[in-house]
Interface confidence: medium
Amino acid sequence: LEVQVPEDPVVALVGTDATLRCSFSPEPGFSLAQLNLIWQLTDTKQLVHSFTEGRDQGSAYANRTALFLDLLAQGNASLRLQRVRVADEGSFTCFVSIRDFGSAAVSLQVAAPYSKPSMTLEPNKDLRPGDTVTITCSSYRGYPEAEVFWQDGQGAPLTGNVTTSQMANEQGLFDVHSVLRVVLGANGTYSCLVRNPVLQQDAHGSITITPQRSPTGAVEVQVPEDPVVALVGTDATLRCSFSPEPGFSLAQLNLIWQLTDTKQLVHSFTEGRDQGSAYANRTALFLDLLAQGNASLRLQRVRVADEGSFTCFVSIRDFGSAAVSLQVAAPYSKPSMTLEPNKDLRPGDTVTITCSSYRGYPEAEVFWQDGQGAPLTGNVTTSQMANEQGLFDVHSVLRVVLGANGTYSCLVRNPVLQQDAHGSVTITGQPMTFPPEA
């Protein structure tokens, strides 16, 4: 017996009625006395509703189900589920037995729209540029779990310091709270979009913050113009200074270091005390020098991933900021040279010379020269591969036809450190083996 149900899930809003469609094709002469119809939960096999022995046996599911009795004889075995709840979500199986037997399962997808988000700001008074604020976006009584997106006033995504929590209430509906922690600029709009993925319904809220600026003008924050170059594994100081006024005390100071691009918090000093490192516990301030206006940041055990721009925000009564660039570097090892083939070499043979140098950063520049210092720019292939730490191994291959004799040297240059590492190989005119035998 062929039993037909919709392929796609039936989507029903919480509190409304849903129809789980199910149909069969009755043969001529069919009477309801022959029909056994059973609806049950697919997974648990719990009885939901049944029609047997020529009559409706009623709902076994919280008295919220009904059949379309006047349509049963035409093959309509659909089930009406009233006042849908989150707990109803799932698969329902429609069993139909006349002389033959057939069944099919239909999915119920429950949904509830999210409310328009309410936006709260903490702190919400006397805000100044450079202050760190927490913006909370709350939307209520939705189902299923929401997707939450944050954007700035230009529509750019804010993916930085966001924490989203979703809690189900007794009815299984979710309240979503998404918290964005952000350092205020001169002004800004922050918007939150809460999406119901089933209903494709968007609810959004936004908040525009215009911090107060002191009429006396901005704090002048000074940083080095040139990038700070630091070797991998060493400590780096990102210099930043301001000029404290007479009577200045650290209780007045808000100092925030953050990554310029992503706005990720790195380190802060607020409310008169060091709030510590938010950056892998590898940063420190020069606390004994802060009162003199030294806001510099110490970054320990520098890694390739640290490279980039760091912004130093200083807020006292006024506000100022400046960005300093960190350029990470690592010296390349002395190149090792290999020759292929390396036995019985004669003038006119074509050989491949490989120059390998390891664990440098950033990518190297590779130069080949002959014994007179003239460049060899011919048949050279250079590849550079980064390891897990982001350090590069460089392999440069020179393919050359041997002359009567010759020296071939490879120079690996670190463009940031202007450090050169070089290796060379000398091939004489007589038949020879490389490396020369003792």
Epitope: E147, F149, Q151, G153, Q154, G155, A156, P157, T159, G185, A186, T189, S191, C192, L193, R195, P197, Q200, D202, H204, S206
Partner: antibody, heavy 121, light 106 residues
Framework: EVQLVQSGAEVKKPGSSVKVSCKAS????????IHWVRQAPGQGLEWIGY????????DYNQKFKDRTTLTADRSTSTAYMELSSLRSEDTAVYYC??????????????WGQGTTVTVSS | DIQLTQSPSFLSASVGDRVTITCRAS?????MNWYQQKPGKSPKPWIY???NLASGVPSRFSVSVSGTEHTLTISSLQPEDFATYYC?????????FGQGTKLEIK
Amino acid sequence: EVQLVQSGAEVKKPGSSVKVSCKASGYSFTSYTIHWVRQAPGQGLEWIGYINPNSRNTDYNQKFKDRTTLTADRSTSTAYMELSSLRSEDTAVYYCARYSGSTPYWYFDVWGQGTTVTVSS
Amino acid sequence: DIQLTQSPSFLSASVGDRVTITCRASSSVSYMNWYQQKPGKSPKPWIYATSNLASGVPSRFSVSVSGTEHTLTISSLQPEDFATYYCQQWSSNPLTFGQGTKLEIK
């Protein structure tokens, strides 16, 4: 009428730089970000980066970060894109576009007419 | 990076046909925009914020969404609809476009 008018076509040698301008009119230049998008011959659209003319904040596609500089002159309502170390694969039409809309929905509502940059030795 | 994959890349159809173009995102996006481009011209905004028609775009265009799959439908193709269509997102950096779907006259 809101318009973005770009500078004329350029022919450049490999290794050189090009600077394309985009003059805005008919709206407040500092109120919207200007993005740069390129399109190689017969290819799709590729985002280069954007500048906020008000704050002069920039953000770049990592692919272009090392070779691209975006600037804006508020006094002339003009945005600039400079691309250095040109290679033949940089041959493309370069568009500036205004990213507009209302929170939280944004899109490129106005595009420049495009500037053809040809890199050839 | 969020990748946007459009299918098909090329589509031949006749005036009056109903056609669909799909843009699949590699992860959830907060909204999707669509642009129309004709040869030798700049792109034009076509659909913004997932399903809103830009100014002057006829109502035969519509978008439906299922998960991360956005489907642009033209209910009855007109001669002026033959062009290349691009989807675009900026839910996370970098901003990305689909590779484009070129709609040609059969």
